[in-house]
Interface confidence: low
């Protein structure tokens, strides 16, 4: 007679279990277990009992113990039930904003989870249960319909799964979806009222007012005031179900001509819009264009100045020839040009008035490296035991790396205060290196010994 212990097990997916196979005869010809699971036999004394560790149990399984005794062969099964919580509990995506009076369908999808007989899906508004159904199908799907009301505004809807293993001596496992927060709204069919000047001059300010009644919730209404592509920044005053948005509009040269003034009220996924035209005249700042803002020494650089077609420009004080909206100059970049500003001034006559605009750009010149006598003297003579600071400055853009070595190894401590010793004497090769190249210079240090009478 073959027996198995335990005869019934519930375990988490991927878990392990010890199964004991026993037989009633003392000397069985055969005693073992039949299972597709990974198994490991534990060594025990005696022949009529074997213990196996079955591991990585991913699904329900029925391992079978068997034995062969003199009085015949027999088997016994153990029933392994795997449990696991769902891998996905999700409310189908919905627009967060819903108009009052609309029917809203909530759909919850549940993937995985076992045993399904113990798995329930619950749809909730806050903590209030709207629907409870067993999980059926893969994925399991539970739906319910809600009529959107004003007082639903801000309510959280969610979906919860309950894997109830309390009858099996375990606990209640709950998984909850990310909440869906419902925002309800009312946007009236009437467009907003827009009051603004019809004509605006560049560099002056006008006031624009946009208002609308009958909104819910008014505090959530977004007001977009725009002149052409330029968004205005209004100050919004709210009433119980109304708002008034007031903005100062400063127009730029980009807005010249006939522009569209827009007031759009967005609430939820709906909007109401009012359009008006505003006529603007302007004059943009000139544009300074360098062929390259960063060049190596000796490179030819073209500097162009371009302005409004009716403007007259000067570039670094030199008027365009002939007088007009464009000027350019050509230069060969020198180290002295590094950081040089190129300034373009444009003048435009608008209604008999002269308007001036400026624009400046800077040129960066890469040069060097340089080592010269002024900043890196070739000869130093110092008394022995005196305190000295060897100075050698390399110039260039980018700033070069400088090393001074005697015999290729002994460094001269540039910029550091040192006590002069005999070791310091000798000729050093100073090498300045940057991405622009490298230069070398010999520096000789002479040490004067003190005389003793």
């Amino acid at each position: 007679q073959t027996s198995v212990s335990p005869s019934k097990v519930i375990l988490p997916r991927g878990g392990s279990v010890l199964v004991t196979c026993s037989t009633s005869c003392d000397q069985p010809k055969l005693l073992g277990i039949e299972t597709p699971l990974p198994k490991k036999e534990l060594l025990l004394p005696g022949n009529n009992r074997k213990v196996y560790e079955l591991s990585n149990v991913q699904e329900d399984s029925q391992p079978m113990c068997y034995s062969n005794c003199p009085d015949g062969q027999s088997t016994a099964k153990t029933f392994l039930t795997v449990y696991w919580t769902p891998e996905r509990v999700e409310l189908a995506p919905l627009p967060s904003w819903q108009p009052v009076g609309k029917n809203l369908t909530l759909r919850c999808q549940v993937e995985g989870g076992a045993p399904r007989a113990n798995l329930t899906v619950v749809l909730l508004r806050g903590e209030k249960e709207l629907k409870r159904e067993p999980a059926v199908g893969e994925p399991a799907e539970v739906t319910t319909t809600v009529l959107v009301r004003r007082d639903h505004h801000g309510a959280n809807f969610s979906c919860r799964t309950e894997l109830d293993l309390r009858p099996q001596g375990l606990e209640l496992f709950e998984n909850t979806s990310a909440p869906y927060q419902l925002q309800t709204f009312v946007l009236p069919a009437t467009p907003p009222q827009l009051v603004s000047p019809r004509v605006l001059e560049v560099d002056t300010q006008g006031t624009v007012v946009c208002s609308l009644d009958g909104l819910f919730p008014v505090s959530e209404a977004q007001v977009h005031l725009a002149l052409g592509d330029q968004r205005l920044n209004p100050t919004v005053t709210y009433g119980n179900d109304s708002f008034s948005a007031k903005a100062s509009v400063s127009v730029t040269a980009e807005d010249e001509g006939t522009q569209r003034l827009t007031c759009a009220v967005i609430l939820g996924n709906q909007s109401q819009e009012t359009l008006q035209t505003v006529t603007i005249y302007s004059f943009p700042a000139p544009n300074v264009i360098l062929t390259k803002p960063e060049v190596s020494e000796g490179t030819e650089v073209t500097v162009k100045c371009e302005a409004h077609p009716r403007a007259k420009v000067t570039l670094n004080g030199v008027p365009a020839q002939p007088l007009g909206p464009r000027a350019q100059l050509l230069l060969k970049a020198t180290p002295e040009d590094n950081g040089r500003s190129f300034s373009c001034s444009a003048t435009l006559e608008v209604a008999g008035q002269l308007i001036h605009k400026n624009q400046t750009r800077e040129l960066r010149v890469l040069y060097g490296p340089r080592l010269d006598e002024r900043d890196c003297p070739g000869n130093w003579t110092w008394p022995e035991n005196s305190q000295q600071t060897p100075m050698c400055q390399a110039w260039g853009n980018p700033l070069p790396e400088l090393k001074c070595l005697k015999d290729g190894t002994f460094p001269l401590p540039i910029g550091e205060s040192v006590t002069v010793t005999r070791d310091l004497e000798g000729t050093y090769l100073c090498r300045a290196r940057s991405t622009q190249g490298e230069v070398t210079r010999k520096v000789t240090v002479n040490v004067l010994s003190p005389r003793y009478e």
């Epitope: 330029q230 943009p284 544009n287």
Partner: nanobody, 128 residues
Framework: QVQLQESGGGLVQPGGSLRLSCAAS????????MYWVRQAPGKGLEWVSG????????YYADSVKGRFTISRDGSKKMVYLQMDSLKPEDTAVYFC?????????????????????WGQGTLVTVSS
């Protein structure tokens, strides 16, 4: 006189956070896009982030997306860069800048540096 002044840099451990600020003056702040760029030691300029004149549209380089947040405060004339989950490769001098030409103020995307008005920069060092 246009002026941009950055602050908020410093030494921070990997995974830490910093908030950079840029104070702007000398121009109509609400009309212009603002940007942050950075220059790592020995490297060229790298465009980091941009924000439109109204603060509604923001742009980020792929290297900082999801970690950095650009914002602006029109009343204070300030631009901010909130830097979270910092990495050693974020070590750089961070510059604030503004495009000064009028027709750049409303374009729908970030123009490349260099630009017209720059701050002095603030150093951010990410190291353990």
């Amino acid at each position: 006189q246009v002026q941009l002044q950055e602050s908020g840099g410093g030494l921070v451990q990997p995974g830490g956070s910093l908030r950079l600020s840029c104070a702007a003056s000398g121009f109509t702040f609400s009309n212009y896009w603002m940007y942050w760029v950075r220059q790592a030691p020995g490297k060229g300029l790298e465009w980091v982030s941009g924000i439109d004149h109204g603060g509604d549209s923001t742009y980020y380089a792929d290297s900082v997306k999801g970690r950095f947040t650009i914002s602006r405060d029109g009343s204070k004339k300030m631009v901010y860069l909130q830097m979270d989950s910092l990495k050693p490769e974020d070590t750089a001098v961070y510059f604030c800048y503004v495009q000064a030409a009028a027709w750049w103020s409303l374009v729908g995307g970030p123009p490349p540096p260099p630009s017209d008005y720059w701050g002095q920069g603030t150093l951010v060092t990410v190291s353990s």
